[in-house]
């Protein structure tokens, strides 16, 4: 989990900083967003408990030709210690809802700071 | 280039039923992920079913569970919604949509009226 070199730094990051660096970057979609986010594209809900970052990623990176959130892809994909694909859901990844790409980045970002305050940085 | 055109929306009677049509071209139908989509009058964009490629799993919001069904004939490029049991909660404009593509890729939309 500590293995995100290439995002902000030449070197491993430390988990603090990947996390703060995930939530900068989701605040940076949030309040650059004009018009709708990834044109209104919708994605699965997650449950924001264990295994998140995982399912993260696998609701988004369904995702494609949305420059918005592509540095958000990336960076998800450091948290994850396996490789996602497109079409693939995990056993914890329950398909209930969908919802708007700009909302799952708001429901994520504030779990995620959350996470930072309670110093839960993996 | 993707081309969705829904059909079969109309004004029904609480209780009635529908069935809407979306004819699908400008991609590979059988292999793609689709979705329902509905929007409310002066509402935002919400969520109605979900049917994967091979039809082995349909998904479908809490509020339309057990009164509206999902399916696909892949052999005619076809999504269809039926729609029963209507409730004048149900009234939309309702789209099909290849999952995971944004509006600009979505059809016009087909009205649907539940009003006694």
């Known amino acids: 989990l500590t293995c995100l070199g290439g995002f902000a730094s030449p070197g491993p990051v430390p988990p603090s900083t990947a996390l703060r660096e995930l939530i900068e970057e989701l605040v940076n979609i949030t309040q650059n967003q004009k018009a709708p986010l990834c044109n209104g594209s919708m994605v699965w809900s997650i449950n924001l408990t264990a295994g998140m970052y995982c399912a993260a990623l696998e609701s988004l990176i369904n995702v494609s030709g949305c420059s918005a959130i592509e540095k958000t892809q990336r960076m998800l994909s450091g948290f994850c210690p396996h490789k996602v694909s497109a079409g693939q859901f995990s056993s914890l990844h329950v398909r209930d809802t969908k919802i708007e790409v700009a909302q799952f980045v708001k429901d994520l970002l504030l779990h995620l700071k959350k996470l930072f305050r309670e110093g839960q940085f993996n | 280039e993707v081309q969705l055109l829904e059909s079969g929306g109309g004004l029904v009677q609480p209780g009635g039923s529908l069935r809407l049509s979306c004819a699908a071209s400008g991609f590979t139908f059988d292999v793609a992920e689709m979705d329902w989509v509905r929007q409310a009058p002066g509402k935002g964009l919400e969520w109605v079913s979900t049917i994967s490629p091979s039809r082995r799993g349909t998904y479908y919001a809490d509020s339309v569970k057990g009164r509206f069904t999902i399916s696909r004939d892949n052999s005619k490029n076809t999504l269809y919604l039926q729609m029963n049991s209507l409730r004048a909660e149900d009234t939309a404009v309702y789209y099909c949509?290849?999952?995971?593509?944004?509006?600009?890729?979505w059809g016009p939309g087909t009205l649907v009226t539940v009003s006694s």
């Open positions: 949509a290849k999952a995971y593509t944004g509006r600009s890729w």
